[in-house]
């Protein structure tokens, strides 16, 4: 008598999440009499997936009518596949008895589920860094299968190379996660720059997913300071200018000190942007020279984005009052503050 064969023709089957999977199984003989059962996994921990005779398996249906007299096709269809359905499925023939006795197993069909990666989420550093420093951005995407995936980083369209990427777990799993870190060197011109994390996967049909982060969230561009004296006015008042240029973010406090004493404090607000995303601010101070016996030391003190204050000082000479004791500068005047302190 010919030995019964349980034939599972496909070693593996790949299905997109949400679709149906057909797992084929035929037997070579109608005897001995006994049921067919489908299991996922092997050994004592295996799970019963379908018993053609009894039980409630709402997502599993027989492909052909198992009650047909000469039926030798015991293929099943599993609907609405999720990544959790991945595994090796065995078609197992039992001999009828009390209880039924396992007789022969098919070689198994490995079901893999194609699942799309989640939208990449890009996060930047917790604190801002200044130009010429390197900052790290991370990109994460989850829930995809199969494991093969490509992740690329771009800054303003140019691919970044200082990148470290990990896909977890290392071995076979129902789904996978990817985490990548890119190190980006900041420049003063990066306020309008953007980093993009691009994820390509077989389930995306050549249309990669992208996550973005703006470098404006990560960068601090410290200001340049310049203090100049404008021409002496007829009423013996000297106009001193503090030009604060090319800074980002806008959060800035300017304090005028006269011979070390606080004269006035101002906060930057509603400044127009330069083309590169930075800001400029100009503050004026009128000093009444005739009210002073000695030279006056004026200090423009700028505290930018919570960083230690930066000072720039200028001495106004009182001994002689030439008409021109300074020159106009070419900095953009994007805001004016004028006040006579006497």
């Amino acid at each position: 008598e010919e030995e019964l064969q349980v034939i599972q023709p496909e070693k593996s089957v790949s299905v997109a999440a949400g679709d149906s999977a057909t797992l084929n199984c035929t037997v070579s003989s109608l005897i001995p009499v006994g049921p067919i059962q489908w299991f996922r996994g092997a050994g004592p921990g295996r799970e019963l997936i379908y018993n053609l005779k009894e039980g409630h398996f709402p997502r599993v249906t027989a492909v052909s009518d198992p009650t047909k007299r000469n039926n030798m096709d015991f293929s099943i269809r599993i609907s609405n596949i999720t990544p959790a359905d991945a595994g090796t499925y065995y078609c197992v023939k039992f001999r009828k008895g009390s209880p039924d006795v396992e007789l022969k197993s098919g070689a198994g069909t490995e079901l893999s589920v194609r699942a799309k990666p989640s939208a990449p989420v890009v996060s930047g550093p917790a604190v801002r860094a200044t130009a010429e420093h390197t900052v790290s951005f991370t990109c994460e995407s989850h829930g995809f299968s199969p494991r093969d995936i490509t992740l690329k980083w771009f800054k303003n369209g140019n691919e970044l190379s200082d990148v470290q990427t990990n896909v977890d777990p290392a071995g076979k799993s129902v789904s996978y996660s990817i985490r990548s870190t890119a190190r980006v060197l900041l420049t003063r011109r990066d306020v309008h720059s953007q980093v993009i994390c691009e994820v390509a996967h077989v389930t995306l049909q050549g249309d990669p997913l992208r996550g973005t982060a703006n470098l404006s969230e990560a960068i601090r561009v410290p200001p340049f300071l310049e203090v100049t004296q404008q021409s002496m006015r007829a009423d013996n008042q000297v106009n001193v200018t503090c030009q604060v240029t090319k800074f980002y973010p806008q959060r800035l406090q300017l304090t005028w000190l006269e011979n070390g004493n606080v004269s006035r404090t101002e906060m930057a607000s509603a400044l127009p942007e330069n083309k590169d995303g930075t800001y400029n601010w100009t503050s004026w101070l009128l000093v009444n020279v005739s009210a002073h016996r000695d030279d006056v030391k004026l200090t423009c003190q700028v505290e930018h984005d919570g960083q230690p204050a930066v000072n720039k000082s200028f001495s106004v000479k009182v001994s002689a009052h030439p008409k021109e004791q300074g020159s106009n500068t070419a900095a953009e005047n994007t805001g004016t503050n004028e006040r006579n302190i006497y």
Partner: antibody, heavy 122, light 112 residues
Framework: QVQLQESGPGLVKPSETLSLTCTVS????????WSWIRQPPGKGLEWIGF???????FYQSSLKSRVTISLDTSKNQFSLKMTSVTAADTAVYYC????????????????WGQGTTVTVSS | DIVMTQSPLSLPVTPGEPASISCRSS???????????LDWYLQRPGQSPQLLIY???SRASGVPDRFSGSGSGTDFTLKISRVEAEDVGVFYC?????????FGQGTKVEIK
């Protein structure tokens, strides 16, 4: 080449909980059973229990009330917790991989860790 | 539980000579599918056990062909055709038909 590495304290006080972790490197957790086996000094091998990749656990009946085996697929690790230990639990503890045959039984414990010695003493 | 009994418990051997170890199970390890759930292991001194034979007679990968397994049902034998010095250690049989997995007491093989 799959490798297993046990980690955990070498000394545990009586009545306390023994906790060991096995890290699987160079291979997959999927499709295998992950076993803990111990060997008291100068004695033979005693199976403690195992966990299948789907989370199903099987334990030695005499230890069942004190033992928990768990799996962390994201870290490729599985763990053993044994409560209320006594001097009789002093042994070399091995983690091991058991292959699964397509039938109901298993197909050999083919990969073993190097073993970690656990002493129960106050 | 299935009880595994090995004999002898100690086996002095001469290099180049054959050796044989017996293992008996308290119930048949031949499953209805025709598969035998009996494995053999060797634990060399100071090392972890290693799988030699699975399924009663199949050699594990990397195991020299001087090792062979035979038997069915409840009586099994491990044969070493020509013993080598590296074969010293404790040999265990184990059953994998049902949980709990159980092992024999071990047979200590040492050079005469």
């Amino acid at each position: 080449q799959v490798q297993l590495q046990e980690s955990g304290p070498g000394l545990v006080k009586p009545s306390e909980t023994l906790s060991l972790t096995c890290t699987v490197s160079g291979g997959s957790i999927r499709d295998y059973y992950w076993s803990w086996i111990r060997q008291p000094p100068g004695k033979g091998l005693e199976w403690i229990g195992f966990i299948y990749y789907n989370g199903r656990t099987f334990y030695q009946s005499s230890l069942k009330s004190r033992v928990t085996i768990s799996l962390d697929t994201s870290k490729n690790q599985f763990s053993l917790k044994m409560t209320s230990v006594t001097a009789a639990d002093t042994a070399v503890y091995y983690c091991a991989r058991v292959r699964a045959y397509s039938g109901i039984g298993l197909d050999g414990t083919d990969v073993w860790g190097q073993g970690t010695t656990v002493t129960v003493s106050s | 539980d299935i009880v595994m009994t090995q004999s002898p418990l100690s086996l002095p051997v001469t290099p180049g000579e054959p050796a044989s170890i017996s293992c008996r199970s308290s119930q048949s390890l031949l499953y209805s599918t025709g598969y035998t759930y009996l494995d053999w292991y060797l634990q060399r001194p100071g090392q972890s056990p290693q799988l030699l034979i699975y399924g009663g007679s199949s050699r594990a990968s990397g195991v020299p062909d001087r090792f062979s397994g035979s038997g069915s049902g409840t009586d099994f034998t491990l044969k070493i055709s020509r013993v080598e010095a590296e074969d010293v250690g404790v040999f265990y049989c184990g059953q994998a038909l049902q949980t709990p997995l159980t092992f024999g007491q071990g047979t200590k093989v040492e050079i005469k």
